[in-house]
């Protein structure tokens, strides 16, 4: 069966939107009005992995681009990157672990924990216009809570 996907945008809990910054980087910044059209649309695919009521494994691709968020070790540090894939083979139900995030819903907010690196989360800085990153903290200065906005296909 084909993998189930939906199109969406994400905003962090400070209402910053995610935009492309160069070919392989996302940044978080406040957008208004027509600038909202700059925000990236994700194709969120529901993939194979450990699942529970509030934890759902997903992959986050960029809509109509052969790019997926993935988690890899760089300089001994778990790092978030945008990775090119062969569009003929992706998305798929059994995604490699580096592409998988546990979507965790808490109080109507979403966290995205790396399946490859437990306790590391898609994060944004309090500061404006900084790259989105894989962070190792929760509940401090950096932001790990997001809201999801559905986008029609």
């Amino acid at each position: 069966a084909p993998v189930r996907s939906l199109n969406c945008t994400l905003r962090d809990s400070q209402q910053k939107s995610l935009v492309m910054s160069g070919p392989y980087e996302l940044k978080a910044l406040h957008l208004q009005g027509q600038d909202m059209e700059q925000q990236v649309v994700f194709s969120m695919s529901f993939v194979q992995g450990e699942e529970s009521n509030d934890k759902i494994p997903v992959a986050l691709g960029l809509k109509e681009k052969n790019l997926y968020l993935s988690c890899v070790l760089k300089d001994d540090k778990p790092t978030l990157q945008l990775e090119s894939v062969d569009p003929k083979n992706y998305p798929k139900k059994k995604m490699e672990k580096r592409f998988v995030f546990n979507k965790i819903e808490i109080n109507n907010k979403l966290e995205f924990e790396s399946a490859q690196f437990p306790n590391w989360y898609i994060s944004t800085s309090q500061a404006e216009n900084m790259p989105v990153f894989l962070g190792g903290t929760k509940g401090g200065q950096d932001i790990t809570d997001f809201t999801m906005q559905f986008v029609s296909s």
Epitope: K77, W120, M130, P131, G136, T137, K138
Partner: antibody
Framework: EVQLVQSGAEVKKPGASVKVSCKAS????????MHWVRQAPGQGLEWVGL????????VNNQKFKGRVTMTRDTSTSTAYMELSSLRSEDTAVYYC???????????WGQGTLVTVSS | EIVMTQSPATLSVSPGERATLSCRAS??????IHWYQQKPGQAPRLLIK???DSDYGIPARFSGSGSGTEFTLTISSLQSEDIAVYYC??????????FGQGTKLEIK
């Protein structure tokens, strides 16, 4: 009130080890990156390494080649830095500091003077 | 690793005058630079984060600017209590976090 309180001054012989503590209060210990930065007498600031209390990840300056061990106790909100095989060049004030991911160190401990002398 | 180079090593400025401290990164760090003030016998104190954001409680005479590789810390009207060593530090690419060698600010 955010506070980082470090252990007291130490005098060690070359080849020995030293363990410095940093007790955090007034904030969520697991919500920040905890750094160790040192300053030799009359010199500048040098990053030693960091620990992430939330997931126990550590990374240090390659300069220290495995001589540095950083640990934490989340039950007491305390970070520790142990430096082994001490040499005279390790004489310095060692600071702990908290930061966000991009390293803005907004609170610092008072510093711990480690003196290495035979 | 990213090397941070500060200039000048020592700066002498008259009270009430403007002090301009520079920091250069060996590669593009965007705005991921932070400035610290350190007085003798004290721990460093964060002044400016992310190139231009003042930390809480920092007097308005301190400001930061720049992006990419060239950055500036400005003290608009020097006070005697501003005499200290100032350090820049990058957080764009770690490990390691790296500091500049410092600029010593003196009263002329």
């Amino acid at each position: 009130e955010v506070q980082l309180v470090q252990s007291g001054a130490e005098v060690k012989k070359p080849g020995a080890s030293v363990k410095v503590s940093c007790k955090a209060s007034g904030f969520s210990f697991t919500g920040y990156y905890m750094h160790w930065v040192r300053q030799a007498p009359g010199q500048g600031l040098e990053w030693v390494g960091l620990i992430i209390p939330h997931n126990d990840y550590t990374v240090n300056n390659q300069k220290f080649k495995g001589r540095v061990t950083m640990t934490r106790d989340t039950s007491t909100s305390t970070a520790y830095m142990e430096l082994s095989s001490l040499r005279s060049e390790d004489t310095a004030v060692y600071y702990c500091a908290r930061s966000d991911y991009y390293g803005a160190m907004d609170y610092w401990g008072q510093g711990t003077l480690v003196t290495v002398s035979s | 690793e990213i090397v941070m180079t500060q200039s000048p090593a020592t700066l002498s400025v008259s009270p009430g005058e403007r002090a301009t401290l520079s920091c250069r990164a060996s590669q593009n760090i965007g705005t991921s630079i932070h400035w610290y003030q350190q007085k003798p016998g004290q721990a460093p104190r964060l002044l400016i984060k992310y190139a231009s954001d003042s930390d809480y409680g920092i007097p308005a005479r301190f400001s930061g600017s720049g992006s990419g590789t060239e950055f500036t810390l400005t003290i608009s009207s020097l006070q005697s209590e501003d005499i200290a060593v100032y350090y820049c530090q990058q957080g764009a690419s770690w490990p390691p976090f790296t500091f500049g060698q410092g600029t010593k600010l003196e009263i002329k």
